[in-house]
């Protein structure tokens, strides 16, 4: 129940963590014109990593898209590409870990597919994920340096009598929307791994099969010499009546591909 | 047709108050910032306050701030300005106008005479 | 505060001459989000409200005649009148709309030669 349950709230986590990165890449408040010269300004200027908008005092808004690729900075490229792959990744890593679910059935899968699926899944969320923190964490940079340049060269003007205001951006809102996003998406692919290993599927535990000697009623049951060498899962040397039947979810110890990611 | 009808003016008495509106038809009022610009006999415009269309925003200029409040009623397609220990230098035709793109207004009321003497 | 000046306060012209109206600010009135100047300029004749004539600097308000045309940027800006009708012969005002407090010129008059 617990892998389930983990698998689940990492999709989940994930699923909100991917909607936030596409809301953050398509927002327009990547970078806000910074109010503190001019709290009362008439004119209010934002950026986005696809357009660049004006909201007037007035209510009037006006948008302006990059119709550009050569004329834009490397950076704002670096960053597109970045929360484009982190998108990329996250929906095929969506699109996969749907399939990986343990609450639903598809045909015949086997638990060792699930298992598989689930775990590049989660890879790809955390990269996911990475990109975003990436993308956003260069555009922050990009505009902490450009507005300690424009704050030293703030005022331009002849013999101070005409000032010419540069105007100067800060973190918009796209930012944390983004910062947030990524960290979401990295936690659920986090989960998607941790939950990965508790579906591995265990070595198969034959039923157990009854052998009737002259004197003596023997149960043998295959695989218990597993106690003493540590490998099998019945490391508590417990009796396996059942046959080797067992709960969805019971921990697994053994080691397996999946415990060295 | 767009129509600003300023109400409200008259004699008051230094440190006095009074009640301005502006009754607005023709447009969408909650779509629109409206202002209040004044105009002293034989001088110039003088801007008095703005207010958002939904409320959110209010601006003073600085000699009024304190004794001039902006507000508006939607509802009632209504601008206000209440003014409160008014002066002689607030004597002055009083205009309420909308406000449009460019910052600018692109409609005025034919105003509203506000004189402050004893 | 911007500091609007408008120069001349006055101007004697005669009906069918240009005119050029010059309007200084104290500070930049040019966005650099939109490479908008905001600037706008104000017709007032006796005894009414005044007309918005021109915004953005440049940009004529519909139904003004295309004898107004606005010009400039920065801090330098002008209102020119080709071929000037009796009509015209009133006050205009340019007004800061880039920063509050929105201010505005004192004004220049123009009246018949």
């Known amino acids: 129940m617990a892998v389930t349950a983990c698998q689940g709230l990492g999709f989940v986590v994930s699923l909100i963590g991917i909607a936030g990165i596409i809301a953050a890449t398509c927002m327009d408040q990547w970078s806000t014109q910074d109010l503190y010269n001019n709290p009362v300004t008439a004119v209010f200027n934002y950026q986005g990593l696809w357009r660049s908008c004006v909201r007037e005092s007035s209510g009037f808004t006006e948008c302006r898209g990059y119709f550009t690729l050569l004329g834009l900075p490397a950076m704002l490229q670096a960053v597109r590409a970045l929360m484009i792959v982190g998108i990329v990744l996250g929906a095929i890593g969506l699109l996969v870990s749907i399939f990986a679910l343990k609450c639903i059935r598809i045909g015949s899968m086997e638990d060792s597919a699930k298992a598989n699926m689930t775990l590049t899944s989660g890879i790809m969320f955390i990269v996911s994920g990475l990109c975003a923190i990436a993308g956003v964490s260069v555009f922050a940079n990009m505009l902490v340096t450009n507005f300690w340049m424009s704050t030293a060269n703030m005022y331009t003007g002849m013999g101070g009598m005409v000032q010419t205001v540069q105007t100067r951006y800060t973190f918009g809102a796209a930012l944390f929307v983004g910062w947030v996003a990524g960290g979401l998406t990295l936690i659920g692919g986090v989960m998607m791994c941790i939950a990965c290993r508790g579906l591995a599927p265990e070595e198969t535990n034959y039923k157990a099969v009854s052998y009737h000697a002259s004197g003596h009623s023997v149960a043998y049951k295959p695989g218990g010499f597993k106690a003493s060498t540590g490998f099998g899962s019945n490391t508590k040397n417990k009796k396996i009546y059942d046959g080797g039947a067992r709960t969805e979810d019971e921990v697994q110890s053994y080691p397996s591909k999946h415990d060295y990611v | 047709e767009v129509q600003l009808v300023e109400s409200g003016g008259g004699l008051v008495k230094p440190g006095g108050s009074r009640k301005l509106s502006c009754a607005a038809s023709?447009?969408?009022?909650?779509?629109?910032?409206m202002h209040w610009v004044r105009q002293a006999p034989e001088k110039g415009l003088e801007w008095v306050a703005y207010?958002?269309?939904?409320?959110?925003?209010?601006y003073y200029a600085d000699t009024m701030k304190g004794r001039f409040t902006i507000s508006r009623d939607n509802a009632k397609n209504t601008l206000f300005l209440q003014m409160t220990s008014l002066r002689s230098e607030d004597t002055a035709m009083y205009y309420c106008a909308r406000f449009v793109r460019g910052n600018s207004m692109d409609y005025w009321g034919q105003g509203t005479s506000v004189t402050v003497s004893s | 505060d911007i500091v609007m000046t408008q120069s001349p306060s006055s101007l004697t012209v005669t009906a069918g001459e240009k005119v050029t109206l010059s309007c200084k600010s104290s500070?930049?009135?040019?966005?650099?989000?939109?490479?908008?100047?905001?600037l706008t300029w104000y017709q007032q004749k006796p005894r009414q409200p005044p007309k918005l004539l021109i915004y953005?600097?440049?940009t004529r308000e519909s139904g003004v005649p295309d004898r107004f045309t606005g010009s400039g940027s920065g801090t330098d800006f002008t209102l020119t009148i080709s071929n000037v009708q009796a009509e015209d012969l009133t006050v205009y005002y340019c007004?800061?709309?880039?920063?509050?407090?929105?201010?505005f010129g004192a004004g220049t008059k123009l009246e018949l030669k």
């Open positions: 207010i958002s269309s939904g409320s959110s925003t209010i």
């Open positions: 500070q930049s009135l040019l966005n650099s989000g939109n490479q908008k100047n905001y």
């Open positions: 023709g447009f969408t009022f909650s779509d629109y910032g």
């Open positions: 953005w600097a440049s």
């Open positions: 007004q800061n709309a880039y920063s509050y407090p929105l201010t």
